[in-house]
């Protein structure tokens, strides 16, 4: 039978690698069965994740799955980092697993690193 | 039922590449991870890397870096790990295992593929 | 890169005994979201490995009762309350809190 608590499926050490200046959405895919929970985003600063008020989010749905997104429109060499989404529901908090973004500052990079680049290079990212 | 399919054993001249792969069923590659892992005659476990068939991002060992290539078709649920400038020390069985990315709720393994690097 | 030890090795045991292996890992492997990400995998003579053990303490679907895993932070056991035939193998912990993952060297299990 299938579980009716809330699910947030992000992945354990998931990341994306992305560009200063670029328009980017960080989905927080959540399953739910009634009632769609209250989810918020965080950033994580050391072992504290610190809510991120006043952004631009958005929900979208799909068959199976709601996606909670936070937008960076563009994106900032500070936004560098990981994130967090929680879900209230039932009273109770729900976390996802942390997604971190690596962030390349074009202007130091004369040409777009690849991805895998980008991860295992660290001298190219803020951190 | 869940099953993980790999490549026949493979017998490669040193300097040269081989690809291994990986066919899954059973379940979404994209809610997993995909490891490679191999295992020297007589041997123990010895990780190489990581595939994330969702986007595509890897990470590998540092021993690994730059000569093997982890990759994902989305489309046929297959993972392929390439291994090149092949010596005899890789003489191995290269494994894939698919680990449940979000709450660890399964990892399955695939039986196995042989690769000798013999001259 | 975190050193994952095993003892014993080697681990002859009577059927229906019970039999115990330690891991110890160079570091801790608690991760910054609280748990702790430490398999144990057992491989048969001619076979692939299998995970029975997720989670330090979680057992896999169809892992028998008789296994069990415990311990925290650089300190892990794996239990098996008696020992069948068909539990003869190589057993691995493996952790996947920090990159790279590492495997234990592997305990050989054996039957007396």
């Known amino acids: 039978k299938e579980s009716c608590d809330v699910q947030l499926y992000i992945k354990r050490q998931s990341y994306h690698s992305i560009f200063a200046g670029d328009p980017f959405k960080l989905e927080c895919p959540v399953k739910y069965c009634a009632h769609r929970p209250q989810v918020t985003w965080c950033k994580l600063n050391g072992t504290t994740c610190v809510k991120l008020e006043g952004r631009h989010t958005s929900w979208k749905q799909e068959k199976n799955l709601s996606f909670f997104i936070l937008h960076f429109e563009p994106v900032l060499p500070s936004d560098n980092g990981s994130y967090r989404c929680s879900a209230n529901f039932l009273s109770a908090i729900i976390e996802s697993h942390s997604t971190t973004l690596y962030v390349t500052d074009v202007k130091s990079a004369s040409e777009r690193p690849s991805k895998d680049e980008m991860a295992s290079r660290p001298w190219l990212l803020y951190s | 039922q869940v099953q993980l399919v790999q490549s026949g054993a493979e017998v490669k001249k040193p300097g040269s590449s081989v690809k291994v792969s990986c066919k899954t069923s059973g379940f979404n590659i994209k809610d997993t991870y995909i490891h490679w892992v191999r295992q020297a005659p007589g041997q123990g476990l010895e990780w190489i890397g990581r595939n994330d068939p969702a986007n595509g991002n890897t990470k590998y060992a540092q021993k690994f870096q730059g000569r093997a290539t982890i990759t994902a078709d989305e489309s046929t649920s297959t993972a392929y790990m390439e291994l090149s400038s092949l010596r005899s020390e890789d003489t191995a069985v290269y494994y894939c295992?698919?680990?449940?990315?979000?709450?660890?709720?399964?990892?399955?393994w695939g039986q196995g593929t042989l690769v000798t690097v013999s001259s | 890169d975190v050193v994952m030890t095993q003892s014993p090795l080697s681990l002859p045991v009577t059927l229906g005994q019970p039999a115990s292996i330690s891991c110890r890992s160079s570091?801790?492997?608690?991760?910054?979201?609280?748990?702790?990400?430490l398999n144990w995998l057992q491989q048969r003579p001619g076979q692939s490995p299998r995970r029975l053990i997720y989670l330090v303490s979680k057992r896999d679907s169809g892992v028998p009762d008789r296994f069990s895993g415990s311990g925290s932070g650089t300190d892990f056991t794996l239990k098996i309350s008696r020992v069948e035939a068909e539990d003869v193998g190589v057993y691995y912990c493996w952790q996947d809190t920090h990159f790279p993952y590492t495997f234990g060297q592997g305990t050989k299990l054996e039957i007396k």
């Open positions: 295992a698919s680990y449940e990315g979000y709450y660890e709720r399964f990892g399955y």
């Open positions: 570091q801790s492997l608690l991760d910054r979201d609280g748990k702790t990400y």
